[in-house]
């Protein structure tokens, strides 16, 4: 299953299968997700070793028994693999890393005035990777505002180096995030030129368009079909790359497929896993385990829980069945992909799906009404599970918020459903930014059922939690995907960067924003927070947050929204906006509703019919 | 409205014991911590203590520990202060309060006289 | 635990003046203290808290300052109603009240 927990001081011996440099914890485990073997991995920060060649080292590790011993490494972090984590799969990171610079080749250097231009033209260009940005307080001054856009053979930096004053991070390219827009067309008898950077063996240009697509270096492929004149090139995918970024040339030729990488589309990208099945097809590779099983769907799905396996074959020979059930062959590659593709035979064939994002049914569970005082405009998938709730009487009104927490289920506050009970009235958007992007034609969910806790009573500030099941399930995407919940009675974690987002007023007597807005605010103990409440009682069911002088918080219309908690890379619910006194008032701290308390409850009510749990806390 | 109404005047023995309850209206005193306070004749005011009639979670000034004990019942909406082994020392008026920080709404007051 | 030294015990003034009361704690409180008035017959009635706050119904001729240890309270234009005990409290760590300022009128 999906093991989301850090090891810090600790390092895993032995299993190598790559060595990278990586700037934090976080991108070292994204690498492991995505590479075809890794199953752990361990990280050295800078202040953990003194060896400088180590230093930002990220070793990626396979085990047959799926862990390695850990010995005691002061400062280390090691961890597992994403895959089987289904939504949390994601090759998008926005982290910007300060007095860092990553080294790579430089291709292009411009001025501009700060980071974020530097990341977004990275962003916009279709050959970097990465960059670094020297800030104007640089001791050289001609280097000062100086935006590097880098590449390097892996997708990751050739080093890292502590540099004062310089900043680095990744291109946005795999958040959906690119302005260059890409080449869905799939060009049939056409070869492409230009320098192979990898040849793998795939059934279809499909799949071989997804592997380029994830490719680091990989901007364009060609594909030899199962017919293709020579036998040794049959079902090889060439992925290529150019200087100018697109085929210097391209060749007419019978039986090949040509196409480009979809890392530059904007708003989609494929997942990044293969979900057909091909009947009549073996797939050849080294054998992980031999298993019977009833049908070809249930020889996948063994395939996807066995983190180790790539790819499967599902055989209907008859000395391979016995009665109902056949054999179904789970296999594994160095690259991930088959060694050999055969045609003709009894078999089916697939791949695993535990790099699919969309995983099953089940989430990531690891007074007056509030919006957002103080805060900043978000950018397009930053908080992914925020939800406007809107209600269609003569008019459509944003009126609160609420958090994705799975497929087909919403939590929000409580308060948001006084005098507003009946299900029809409201709209729920996800997947957006601006709320004036909204117009007759957008998707919205609609409500099947309004889950009120029973213990809240109108216009008290307990208890102020809800459940929306929609009426259909939702596709995760970069940009609609559900938070985690933390685990039941969550006291021990002590959360210190945490953040508020909603649409709601910008000040106490204000109106609703119209790009999402987000906020960091420190949590305050319950026991400070009573002493600045002095007729409410604040519970072991409430969190606040807030700062001493005011100035940040949330406010009317961010009601039901996300108070989210980034903790060991991973952000969780920590609350719900609930109530305050006014909004961002000195020394009156934002009330929420704490998500841990109500664990229970939510677990319960999210049961499906068939009663299996649609909800999971992290182990 | 909001209001907290104590029990009436109480004559009691040296060494004896006695319960004072404070019953609340306009509020679910689950929603709310009762507090108690002590004042003695010609004297200042003495926080007792408190109680959270959700889980009857106690805290009670150190001075005080073992005189007091403090109970709610949510079904009646009563909060009570029971005082063991009275002394001349325990006479005064004791009030209950209610509020989340502080005590924001105040009932009337319960005298209280120990005398042989 | 937290004492609480208030002053004066005592104080007259005439109507239409001005009182000052203060508190000075015997740590730092970090402005977590209220003002009570009290009334004999009736239950205290809270004023202010956090050392400056008005409570919703109190008229502005009440007022708080302080920081740290030291705290003051002041009425302004005194009326013939404002003859009580006034209390202050500590809410930092649990509660102690100061010893009470009777105000009367000359």
């Known amino acids: 299953g999906c093991l989301t927990q850090l090891y810090e001081n600790a390092f895993f011996r032995g299993g190598d299968v790559a060595s990278m440099y990586t700037p934090n914890a976080q991108y070292c485990q994204m690498r492991c997700t995505f590479h075809p073997r890794c199953l752990l991995f361990s990280f050295l920060p800078a202040s953990s070793i003194n060896d400088m060649e180590k230093r930002f080292g990220c070793f990626l590790k396979d085990s047959v028994t799926g862990t390695l011993p850990k010995v005691h490494r002061t400062g280390a972090v090691s961890g597992h693999s994403l895959k089987q984590c289904g939504h949390q799969i994601s090759a998008c990171h926005r982290d910007i890393y300060k007095g860092v610079d990553m080294r790579g080749v430089n291709f292009n250097v411009s001025k501009v005035s700060s980071v974020e231009e530097c990341q977004k033209r990275c962003t916009s260009n279709i050959r970097c990777q990465f960059f670094s940005y020297a800030t104007q307080t640089f001791h050289k001054a001609e280097y000062r505002n100086n935006c590097l856009l880098k590449y390097s053979p892996g997708g990751t930096p050739t080093a890292i180096k502590v540099l004062s004053n310089v900043e680095s991070g990744f291109s946005l390219k795999p958040c959906a995030l690119s302005e260059i827009g890409c080449h869905m067309n799939i060009f049939q008898h056409l070869a492409f030129s230009d320098v192979d950077v990898a040849r793998v063996l795939t059934p279809d240009a499909f799949v071989c368009r997804t592997i380029c697509t994830y490719h680091p270096n990989c901007l364009f492929f060609t594909f030899y079909t199962n017919v293709w004149k020579i036998e040794s090139q049959r079902n090889v995918c060439l992925l290529k790359t150019s200087e100018s970024g697109t085929p210097s040339s391209s060749t007419p030729q019978e039986n090949t497929i040509s196409g480009y990488s979809l890392l530059t589309c904007k708003r989609t990208l494929p997942e990044p896993c293969h979900s057909k099945i091909y009947p009549g097809v073996d797939f050849g590779g080294e054998e992980l385990n031999v298993t019977f099983v009833k049908g070809v769907n249930v020889c996948q799905e063994t395939c996807t829980k066995m983190i180790r396996c790539q790819f499967f074959t599902y055989s209907l020979l008859p000395e391979d069945c016995k009665e109902e059930k056949c054999k179904c062959f789970l296999r594994l590659s160095m690259d991930g992909s088959p060694t050999r593709i055969a045609y003709g035979t009894q078999g089916s064939s697939g791949y695993s799906l535990r790099l699919c994002n969309t995983g099953d049914n089940s989430v990531c569970t690891t007074k007056t009404s509030t919006r957002i005082v103080g805060g900043t405009n978000s950018s397009w998938g930053e908080w992914p599970w925020q939800v406007s709730l809107q209600v269609k009487l003569t008019a459509q009104r944003h009126l609160c918020g609420g958090s994705l927490i799975g497929h087909q289920w919403v939590l929000t506050a409580a308060h948001c459903f006084d005098g507003l009970p009946l299900q029809d009235v409201w709209r729920i958007y996800s997947g957006i930014l601006n709320l004036s992007d909204i117009t007759k034609d957008t998707p919205f969910s609609q409500i099947k059922e309004i889950i009120i806790h029973q213990n809240y009573k109108v216009s008290e500030g307990n208890h102020d939690i809800a459940l929306i099941k929609l009426q259909a399930p939702l596709n995760y995407t970069e940009f609609q995907k559900p938070i985690c919940l933390p685990s039941k009675g969550d006291t021990s974690t002590i959360y210190t960067n945490c953040w508020v987002t909603g649409w709601g007023f910008s000040k106490e007597k204000g109106e609703i924003q119209n790009i999402l807005q987000k906020v960091n605010i420190p949590l305050v103990t319950n026991e400070e927070c009573q002493k600045r409440y002095q007729d409410y009682k604040i519970t072991q069911r409430m969190v606040c947050a807030g700062y001493k002088e005011g100035g940040k918080d949330a406010c009317k219309g961010d009601s039901g929204g996300p108070l989210v908690c980034k903790h060991n890379g991973m952000w969780r619910l920590v609350g719900i906006t609930s109530w305050g006194e006014g909004c961002a008032r000195r020394e009156q701290p934002g009330v929420y509703t704490k998500v841990a308390e109500y664990m229970d409850w939510i677990l319960e009510k999210t049961q499906s019919s068939d009663g299996k749990a649609q909800m999971q806390s992290p182990a | 409205e909001v209001q907290l109404h104590q029990s009436g005047a109480e004559l009691v023995k040296p060494g004896a014991s006695v319960r004072l309850s404070c019953t609340a209206s306009?509020?679910?005193?689950?929603?709310?911590?009762i507090f108690w306070v002590k004042q003695r004749p010609e004297q200042g005011l003495e926080w007792i203590g408190r109680?959270?009639?959700?889980?009857?979670?106690?805290k009670f000034d150190p001075k005080i520990q073992g005189k007091a004990t403090l109970t709610a019942d949510t079904s009646s909406n009563t909060a009570y202060l029971q005082l063991g082994s009275l002394t001349s020392e325990d006479s005064a008026i004791y009030y209950c309060?209610?509020?989340?920080?502080?005590?924001?709404?105040w009932g009337q007051g319960t005298l209280v006289s120990v005398s042989a | 635990d937290i004492q609480m030294t208030q002053s004066p015990s005592s104080l007259s003034a005439s109507l239409g003046g001005k009182v000052t009361i203060t508190c000075k704690a015997s740590h730092d409180i970090n402005k977590y203290i209220a003002w009570y008035q009290h009334k004999p017959g009736s239950g205290p009635r809270l004023l202010i808290h956090?050392?400056?706050t008005l409570q919703s119904d109190i008229p502005s001729r009440f007022s708080g300052s302080g920081s740290g240890r030291d705290y003051s309270f002041s009425i302004s234009n005194l009326e013939p109603e404002d003859i009580a005990t006034y209390y202050c409290?500590?809410?930092?760590?649990?509660?102690?009240f100061g010893g009470g300022t009777k105000l009367e009128i000359k």
């Open positions: 409290l500590q809410y930092d760590n649990l509660f102690t």
């Open positions: 309060a209610k509020g989340g920080g502080l005590f924001a709404y």
């Open positions: 109680i959270d009639p959700e889980n009857d979670n106690t």
């Open positions: 956090f050392t400056s």
């Open positions: 306009g509020f679910n005193i689950k929603d709310t911590y």
